[in-house]
């Protein structure tokens, strides 16, 4: 799939920070999403998980950004990249994990999908 360029990753990180900064209230009314393995292919997996959250304006930009990182079209209920579906977590926790890992990848220059 397409490799997210450094600038695109920076923009994703910045948006994830925007969503979470100083945030204590549950995101998306406390909606739960499938946890994902933070490995290669995580952007598609993240999108497949988050796309099932509807009516949450806070994460719409993140959903659009992730769709640009994923080589195939993703629709709600699709789980081709979501290898493990055994744990659901709050959207806020999911975003925080995604942010932490994306920053880790960025720091190490591994901007793979």
């Amino acid at each position: 799939g397409p490799v997210p360029p450094s600038t695109a990753l920076r923009e994703l990180i910045e948006e994830l920070v925007n969503i979470t900064q100083n945030q204590k209230a549950p995101l998306c009314n406390g909606s739960m999403v499938w946890s994902i393995n933070l490995t290669a292919g995580m952007y598609c997996a993240a999108l497949e998980s988050l796309i099932n959250v509807s009516g949450c304006s806070a994460i719409e930009k993140t959903q659009r950004m992730l769709s640009g990182f994923c080589p195939h079209k993703v629709s709600a209920g699709q789980f081709s990249s979501l290898h493990v579906r055994d744990t659901k977590i709050e959207v806020a926790h999911f975003i925080t994990k995604l942010l932490s890992y994306t920053k880790q990848l960025f720091r190490h220059g591994q901007q793979f999908n």
């Epitope: 920076r10 923009e11 990180i13 910045e14 920070v17 925007n18 979470t20 900064q21 100083n22 945030q23 204590k24 209230a25 942010l99 920053k103 960025f106 720091r107």
Partner: antibody, heavy 126, light 109 residues
Framework: EVQLVESGGGLVKPGGSLRLSCAAS????????MSWVRQAPGKGLEWVGR??????????NYAAPVKGRFTISRDDSKNTLYLQMNSLKTEDTAVYYC?????????????????WGQGTTVTVSS | SYELTQPPSVSVSPGQTARITCSGD??????AYWYQQKSGQAPVLVIY???KRPSGIPERFSGSSSGTMATLTISGAQVEDEADYYC???????????FGGGTKLTVLG
């Protein structure tokens, strides 16, 4: 030792400019979100603005009274934060503090850690 | 612009419990932070993220939050706690910081 040391304050005429510096040591400055806070004589604390770490986008935000006149920047290679103040007004007279930004502590490596400089005095008077 | 409102002053006798409040419309979703400032000194963080206490801060300092109000509680206030206390938070975007007007705590010795 974890510390911040401000410099560059002084007396300046209305309409003039001044650049404040804040030298950081003892922590990973590049990971830190940094703020400028000021305190006018006998008044309360006023948030001036903040700059995120570069990895978090390097976004800079300003308080309404200084937007368009003040510019915050950072040089991670020198562990230094700057505040460029232009078009100064008498109401900008204050002690200026640099500090780690607690909102950014969650993203940096200084969770719950609190670092402030000793402050540098800026006096705007004709 | 967004504002945080604090009472200008609070007075207690030594050993009593002091409560300082901070109200703001965004506080249900944004964390509050509390700073202590003694005369001529830089502020010191005493509570972060509503309820957490930094290392080195005495256990008598605690924080809570409910709805649009955050509260700093000093259980068994001591003379050395006499200072100005400021709440700090952000607007709903999280992008702009704001301090409350400050509360002067007097511990009547």
């Amino acid at each position: 030792e974890v510390q911040l040391v401000e410099s560059g304050g002084g007396l300046v005429k209305p309409g003039g400019s001044l650049r404040l510096s804040c030298a950081a040591s003892g922590f990973t400055f590049s990971n830190a979100w940094m703020s400028w806070v000021r305190q006018a004589p006998g008044k309360g604390l006023e948030w001036v603005g903040r700059i995120r770490s570069k990895i978090d986008g390097g976004t800079i935000n300003y308080a309404a009274p200084v937007k368009g006149r003040f510019t915050i920047s950072r040089d991670d290679s020198k562990n230094t934060l700057y505040l460029q103040m232009n078009s100064l007004k008498t109401e900008d007279t204050a002690v200026y503090y640099c500090a780690t930004d607690q909102v950014g502590a969650y993203y940096g490596d200084y969770y719950g850690m609190d670092v402030w400089g000793q402050g540098t005095t800026v006096t705007v008077s004709s | 612009s967004y504002e945080l409102t604090q009472p200008p002053s609070v007075s207690v006798s030594p050993g009593q419990t002091a409560r300082i409040t901070c109200s703001g419309d965004a506080l249900p979703e944004k964390y509050a932070y509390w700073y202590q400032q003694k005369s001529g000194q830089a502020p010191v963080l005493v509570i972060y993220e509503d309820t957490k206490r930094p290392s080195g801060i005495p256990e008598r300092f605690s924080g809570s939050s409910s709805g649009t109000m955050a509260t700093l509680t000093i259980s068994g206030a001591q003379v050395e706690d006499e200072a100005d206390y400021y709440c700090y938070s952000t607007d709903s975007s999280g992008n702009h910081g704001v301090f409350g007007g400050g509360t002067k705590l007097t511990v009547l010795g």
